[in-house]
C-alpha cells in the first residue's frame, strides 16, 4: 500500500537567463528513497542515487545543477524550457511516485511563483 | 569470509580486447552494486566503472566510455569488465571493489589483475 | 567532473607525530567524501566514508573532518603501520574521482 504522498513547487515561471530551483519533497510514508529522476517531458534530466550519487545528463551539464538536496537547479533559462517537469522517486518497498511541477520562462519580470500543492 | 577475487588479465596489443572476472564470495552479491577501479604503475587511484545490483545503473569513467562494457551474472556470484579497443593508457592493475551500501565507500577489495597493453 | 587535489603530495614524519591531510574539491560535494590508505602491493583499505565516519575496524586515531569543498584527514598519533599512501575520493558525483594521493614517509 503506497501512503506517500509528493509535494511540490507546484506551477512556477522565472525569467529568461535566469534559473530557478525545482523541488519535490516525499512525506507520509517509511520507505527507502533509493533513487529520484528529474525528467523533463520524455528526457532525463538528472538522477540522484542513494547508492552513487548525481548524475547529471551530458546534454544538460552546463545548465542543471544539483540541489538543494534532492531537488534540482536550472540555469540560463530559455523559452524552450517552459513545460512539464517531473520528479520520479523510485523507493523501497512502497515503489515509484511522481510529482509533477509546470515551468513558464517568461521574456519580461513579471516571473510569480504559484502555489504549492500535492500529489497523492 | 568476504572476498572478491580478479581474473583474465595479461599482455595484449593496442586495439584488441579483454574480458576481466571478478569471483565474489562471503556476501549477498546478487543486493550489492559493484565496482572497477583501476591504478597504473605508479600512479593513484581511477574510478572505472560502475553497476548495479540487478545490472542496470551502469556508468562509466569518460576515459572508456563507448569502449569499455561493465556486466555481472548474478547466478554465478561473478563482475565482468570487457574491454575493447584497448590502448596504451589502459595499462592498469585493476581491481573490483564492493561498496558500504548507501555510504559511498569502498570497504571490499579484490587482489587486482594486471592489464598491460603493449605491441 | 568534479577534481579532487590533496596536499601535501608527501609529507615526512616521525612515529607519533600529528598528521594532517587535506583534500579540496572543484566544486561542493557536501560530505560525500571518503578517505583510504593503501600501502606497497596492497588493495586500498577504506578508513573513513561520509567525511568523517570511521570505518568499523579503523583505529580511532584516524579521523576525518569537512564539508563542501575542503575536507581533512588526521591521524593523531602516527604508528609504524601507518606509514603509506591516503588518497580522498568523492562519491557526490559521477563518475567518482579520486585525489592525486598523499605519501607518508617514514623522516
Known amino acids: 500500500m503506497m501512503t506517500g504522498t509528493i509535494e511540490t513547487t507546484g506551477n512556477i515561471s522565472a525569467e529568461k537567463g535566469g534559473s530557478i530551483i525545482l523541488q519535490c519533497h516525499l512525506s507520509s510514508t517509511t520507505a527507502q528513497v533509493t533513487q529520484v529522476n528529474w525528467e523533463q517531458q520524455d528526457q532525463l534530466l538528472a538522477i540522484c542515487n542513494a547508492d552513487l550519487g548525481w548524475h547529471i545528463s551530458p546534454s544538460f551539464k552546463d545548465r542543471v545543477a544539483p540541489g538543494p538536496g534532492l531537488g534540482l537547479t536550472l540555469q540560463s533559462l530559455t523559452v524552450n524550457d517552459t513545460g512539464e517537469y517531473f520528479c520520479i522517486y523510485h523507493t523501497y518497498p512502497d515503489g515509484t511516485y511522481t510529482g509533477r511541477i509546470f515551468l513558464e520562462v517568461l521574456e519580461s519580470s513579471v516571473a510569480e511563483h504559484g502555489a504549492r500543492f500535492q500529489i497523492p | 569470509q568476504v572476498q572478491l577475487v580478479e581474473s583474465g588479465g595479461g599482455v595484449v596489443q593496442p586495439g584488441r580486447s579483454l574480458r576481466l572476472s571478478c569471483a565474489a564470495s562471503g556476501f549477498t552479491f546478487s543486493s550489492s552494486y559493484m565496482h572497477w577501479v583501476r591504478q597504473a604503475p605508479g600512479k593513484g587511484l581511477e574510478w572505472v566503472a560502475v553497476i548495479g545490483a540487478d545490472g542496470s545503473n551502469k556508468y562509466y569513467a569518460d576515459s572508456v566510455e563507448g569502449r569499455f562494457t561493465i556486466s555481472r551474472d548474478n547466478s554465478k556470484n561473478t563482475l565482468y569488465l570487457q574491454m575493447n579497443s584497448l590502448r596504451a593508457e589502459d595499462t592498469a592493475l585493476y581491481y573490483c571493489?564492493?561498496?558500504?551500501?548507501?555510504?559511498?565507500?569502498?570497504?571490499?577489495w579484490g587482489q587486482g589483475t594486471m592489464v598491460t597493453v603493449s605491441s | 567532473d568534479i577534481q579532487l587535489t590533496q596536499s601535501p603530495s608527501s609529507v615526512s614524519a616521525s612515529v607519533g607525530d600529528r598528521v594532517t591531510i587535506t583534500c579540496r574539491a572543484s566544486q561542493g560535494i557536501s560530505s560525500w567524501l571518503a578517505w583510504y590508505q593503501q600501502k606497497p602491493g596492497k588493495a586500498p583499505k577504506l578508513l573513513i566514508y561520509?567525511?568523517?565516519s570511521l570505518q568499523s575496524g579503523v583505529p580511532s586515531r584516524f579521523s576525518g573532518s569537512g564539508s563542501g569543498t575542503d575536507f581533512t584527514l588526521t591521524i593523531s598519533s602516527l604508528q609504524p603501520e601507518d606509514f603509506a599512501t591516503y588518497y580522498c575520493q568523492q562519491a557526490f558525483y559521477l563518475p567518482w574521482t579520486f585525489g592525486g594521493g598523499t605519501k607518508v614517509e617514514i623522516k
Open positions: 561520509g567525511a568523517s
Open positions: 571493489a564492493k561498496p558500504v551500501p548507501r555510504r559511498r565507500g569502498l570497504d571490499v
